[in-house]
């Protein structure tokens, strides 16, 4: 009778992570008597995957009933495959012996390759906000994919970016891989509504790439422009001065009025108007009682935006042209906030 052969008909098997792998193996004879075992790898460090007769292998099931007389099919199924399961699997026939069974013949091996999807790309921007014309870096990371081949692209508002560097780790063979990319983006004043997108394409995604996004609203700071103007006289001895704070982002802003360098009033921007580009406008006004002043008044609108050093704009108020009203001791009326703000 011809000597037993162990046949593994599949040289390789490709399985998606999470699925079940079927590893086929048949023997050509029932003799010699002894169990079949499956190993991953060869040599002394090989890992036992399944023993026909003993041991605990909760992920493994046999394709056929091994207790059936004359069974020669020793194929197995391994459930819930992960990239860590990749490797070459050997079906090995043992001959009964004492004290231990002896390896008799091995199959040629089946290489199991695992396709694993990349994780959703995570895009992160700089820790601190930056102003227009500055260049900022964004990073994109995705993990756990296999095989190694992967494509990563960057977009800003649908326009592909070219200034980026990408690494796939590790460089050598591994059960799964990670990608890390850093893109440089130049900010403009119109970027409050802009998005930076990292797009990852991989064979496991069937042409439907994964995207990670970052909103530039989290990154940009658009400093305000200030304009202080004097409005027509409201009453014989009152002048209305407005401070227009335009095109700023984010909204966090505090405004202080100074009269000849002395703080007159401080307020925080609350009800603002939003521009089409996502920046904000705000207006504050001050009623100045000119009769309280003998000399010209220097009015300063000082704005502290988003924790940055204050910027200011001044206006010289000429009082000589206005008649003095006796008995007034207030230089400026601290009017109610509704009256102060013009929307």
């Amino acid at each position: 009778e011809e000597e037993l052969q162990v046949i593994q008909p599949d040289k390789s098997v490709l399985v998606a992570a999470g699925e079940t792998a079927t590893l086929r193996c048949t023997a050509t004879s029932l003799i010699p008597v002894g169990p079949i075992q499956w190993f991953r790898g060869a040599g002394p460090g090989r890992e036992l995957i399944y023993n026909q007769k003993e041991g605990h292998f909760p992920r493994v099931t046999t394709v056929s009933d091994l207790t059936k007389r004359n069974n020669m099919d020793f194929s197995i199924r391994i459930g819930n495959i992960t990239p860590a399961d990749a490797g070459t699997y050997y079906c090995v026939k043992f001959r009964k012996g004492s004290p231990d069974d002896v390896e008799f013949k091995s199959g040629a091996g089946t290489e199991l390759s695992v396709r694993a999807k990349p994780s959703a790309p995570v895009v992160s921007g700089p820790a601190a906000r930056a102003t227009p014309q500055h260049t900022v870096s964004f990073t994109c990371e995705s993990h756990g994919f296999s095989p190694r081949d992967i494509t990563l692209k960057w977009f800003k508002n649908g326009n592909e970016l070219s200034d980026f560097q990408t690494n796939v780790d590790p460089v050598g063979e591994s059960v799964s891989y990670s990608i890390h990319s850093t893109a440089k983006v130049v900010l403009t004043r119109e970027d409050v509504h802009s998005q930076v997108i990292c797009e990852v394409a991989h064979v496991t995604l069937q042409g439907d790439p994964l995207r990670g996004t970052a909103n530039l609203s989290e990154t940009i700071r658009v400093p305000p422009t200030l304009e202080v103007t004097q409005q027509p006289v409201r009453a014989e001895n009152q002048v209305n001065v407005t401070c227009q704070v335009r095109k700023f982002y984010p909204q966090r802003l505090q405004l202080t009025w100074l009269e000849n360098g002395n703080v007159s009033r401080t307020e925080t921007a609350s009800t603002v108007t939003e521009n089409k580009d996502g920046t904000y406008n705000w207006m504050s006004w001050l009623l100045v009682n000119v009769s309280a002043h003998r000399d010209d008044v220097k009015l300063t609108c000082q704005v502290e935006h988003d924790g940055q050093p204050a910027v200011s704009k001044s206006h010289d108020l000429k009082v000589s042209a206005h008649p003095k009203e006796q008995g007034s001791n207030t230089a400026a009326e601290n009017t109610g906030s509704n009256e102060r703000n013009i929307y």
């Epitope: 003993e54 605990h56 207790t67």
Partner: antibody, heavy 113, light 108 residues
Framework: EVQLQQSGAELVKPGASVKLSCTAS????????MHWVKQRTEQGLEWIGR????????KYAPKFQGKATITADTSSNTAYLQLTSLTSEDTAVYYC??????WGQGTTLTVSS | QIVLTQSPAIMSASPGEKVTLTCSAS???????LYWYQQKPGSSPKLWIY???NLASGVPARFSGSGSGTSYSLTISSMEAEDAASYFC?????????FGGGTKLEIK
């Protein structure tokens, strides 16, 4: 559901023999080896031996060679452990086990005159 | 035969404490064939860790196993009252199969 049901407690005299049983349900005992393990009160576990019910092949720990005999009856899906020439040293709980995962509830054997 | 020596034989740990039990083999054991069992008084042993590092079904994630060759260990990252039990290592790499002497783990 896989279960291993062992026979009830035994009280036997020194010098006598006893045969403990382990009946399997939820699987065919031919598909895996059946093991027997000894545990004396407040002590560790000792592997006695195992049987391949498919062909009756057995292996024993040297300490239990000649003391223990393991057999199996595939028609009743049952494995047996026979212990001979009993002494007080054989007083223990005896477990049957399959694939290291499934264990019987244990049979208490007391050897006393 | 392969002799498995467990240490310590008895130990007590406070809740939240990290615990490491060791199992030393007299000759090399392939990691695929090294199992750990938990046993509580009056109960059959339960498979706790198989193939050195795989947790059996229902075993809390605070347990882990590691090792190779002649040195193996079971670790509990943060001791809980329900972990008080005896733990046995077991090898089925070479006949005769053998158990370690066990470690009795108590809660303080």
């Amino acid at each position: 559901e896989v279960q291993l049901q062992q026979s009830g407690a035994e009280l036997v005299k020194p010098g006598a023999s006893v045969k403990l049983s382990c009946t399997a349900s939820g699987f065919n005992i031919k598909d895996s080896y059946m093991h027997w393990v000894k545990q004396r009160t407040e002590q560790g576990l000792e592997w006695i031996g195992r049987i391949d019910p498919e062909d009756g092949e057995t292996k024993y720990a040297p300490k239990f060679q000649g003391k223990a005999t393991i057999t199996a009856d595939t028609s009743s899906n049952t494995a047996y452990l026979q212990l001979t020439s009993l002494t007080s040293e054989d007083t223990a709980v005896y477990y049957c086990a399959r694939r290291g995962f499934y264990w019987g509830q244990g049979t208490t054997l007391t050897v006393s005159s | 035969q392969i002799v498995l020596t467990q240490s310590p034989a008895i130990m007590s740990a406070s809740p939240g404490e990290k615990v490491t039990l060791t199992c030393s083999a007299s000759s090399s054991v392939s990691s695929s064939y090294l199992y750990w069992y938990q046993q509580k008084p009056g109960s059959s042993p339960k498979l706790w860790i198989y193939s050195t590092s795989n947790l059996a079904s229902g075993v809390p994630a605070r347990f882990s196993g590691s090792g190779s060759g002649t040195s193996y260990s079971l670790t509990i990252s943060s001791m809980e009252a329900e972990d008080a039990a005896s733990y046995f290592c077991y090898q089925w790499s070479t006949h005769p199969y053998t158990f370690g002497g066990g470690t009795k783990l108590e809660i303080k």
